[in-house]
Interface confidence: low
């Protein structure tokens, strides 16, 4: 599923991401835009053999199990395929664990490079939330 900007903002708010660990909703929508272009089915292979999955590009080395990544920790205790669902519950729940891990949203390279320090509220402007 490819979400619309406001559609995703509403879904993320419903799942409790607004101001989760101090990160406003705009941060999460911005991260999803530059990680996956709002596509729940996005996958990208990394040079270390791991793969990033879903709308927030969650990594199989640490967070989910795809049966293909040597040394996977599966800290979210989920199959990576769950992160590709049009229902973003699994991605959100895992993202909450990631953002609580110490580095906050710096764990997402795209957020660090494209969203951090920018007017992230622009990503939810005009949305009925």
């Amino acid at each position: 599923k490819v979400f619309g900007r406001c559609e995703l903002a509403a879904a993320m708010k419903r799942h409790g991401l607004d101001n989760y660990r101090g990160y406003s909703l705009g941060n999460w929508v911005c991260a999803a835009k530059f990680e996956s272009n709002f596509n729940t089915q996005a996958t990208n292979r990394n040079t270390d053999g791991s793969t990033d999955y879903g709308i927030l590009q969650i990594n199989s080395r640490w967070w989910c199990n795809d049966g293909r990544t040597p040394g996977s920790r599966n800290l979210c205790n989920i199959p990576c395929s769950a992160l590709l669902s049009s229902d973003i519950t699994a991605s959100v729940n895992c993202a909450k664990k990631i953002v609580s891990d110490g580095n906050g949203m710096n764990a997402w390279v795209a957020w660090r490079n494209r969203c951090k320090g920018t007017d992230v509220q622009a990503w939810i402007r005009g949305c009925r939330l």
Partner: antibody, heavy 115, light 107 residues
Framework: QVQLQESGAEVMKPGASVKISCKAT????????IEWVKQRPGHGLEWIGE????????YYNEKFKGKATFTADTSSNTAYMQLSSLTSEDSAVYYC?????????WGQGTTLTVS | DIELTQSPATLSVTPGDSVSLSCRAS??????LHWYQQKPHESPRLLIK???QSMSGIPSRFSGSGSGTDFTLSINSVETEDFGMYFC?????????FGGGTKLEIK
């Protein structure tokens, strides 16, 4: 139960192209990788590459880049592999398999003869 | 690419014998090694995943061991239905690679 059903045997002329299909049933097609494997007598098994049907993401063995092209139709739960510019070296049995690192579920194989 | 070398190429045994098939990797692949059996005109069948985990429905006489670069598939008291080709496969890195196979035949 999980099943992968491949298309039937093909006899093709050198230089032609062929498209092999692999229809998946019994599981969520979009969220598992489909792998393609080549087997020639005396050459063992060779991994050609893989596709994740839901996203269209593909990864190819360098050896088969330009030779194989993967696609998938999620409406029919079918993965396809097209082989182009066929030569006698492409004569083989081609398998699809569901990818989990290891391959528990396999298609029955499609025999391609280039002659 | 990781190269997998299987030995011996052919193993001639009598039913009831116990045998060991070897698979050696060109570099360490941890435990990311899987074993398949293939009969003529059939698709490969997964016997063992991740070096030593037996698949459901596979007879207990099949077992796997090893780590790093050296791996072994053992068959305790071979039965006639066990004859065929055996392949190892690594999933430690891309491209996935298979060994050249060991043919288990009746003496």
């Amino acid at each position: 139960q999980v099943q992968l059903q491949e298309s039937g045997a093909e006899v093709m002329k050198p230089g032609a192209s062929v498209k092999i299909s692999c229809k998946a049933t019994g599981y969520t097609f979009t969220t598992y990788w489909i792998e393609w494997v080549k087997q020639r007598p005396g050459h063992g098994l060779e991994w050609i590459g893989e596709i994740l049907p839901g996203s269209g993401s593909t990864y190819y063995n360098e050896k088969f880049k330009g030779k194989a092209t993967f696609t998938a139709d999620t409406s029919s739960n079918t993965a396809y592999m097209q082989l182009s510019s066929l030569t006698s070296e492409d004569s083989a049995v081609y398998y699809c398999a569901r990818g989990d690192g290891h391959y528990y579920y396999w298609g029955q194989g499609t025999t391609l003869t280039v002659s | 690419d990781i190269e997998l070398t299987q030995s011996p190429a052919t193993l001639s045994v009598t039913p009831g014998d116990s045998v060991s098939l070897s698979c050696r990797a060109s570099q360490s692949i941890s435990n990311n090694l899987h074993w398949y059996q293939q009969k003529p005109h059939e698709s490969p069948r997964l016997l063992i995943k991740y070096t030593s985990q037996s698949m459901s429905g596979i007879p207990s006489r099949f077992s796997g061991s090893g780590s790093g670069t050296d791996f072994t598939l053992s068959i305790n008291s071979v039965e006639t239905e066990d004859f065929g080709m055996y392949f190892c496969q690594q999933s430690n890195s891309w491209p996935r690679t298979f060994g050249g196979g060991t043919k288990l035949e009746i003496k």
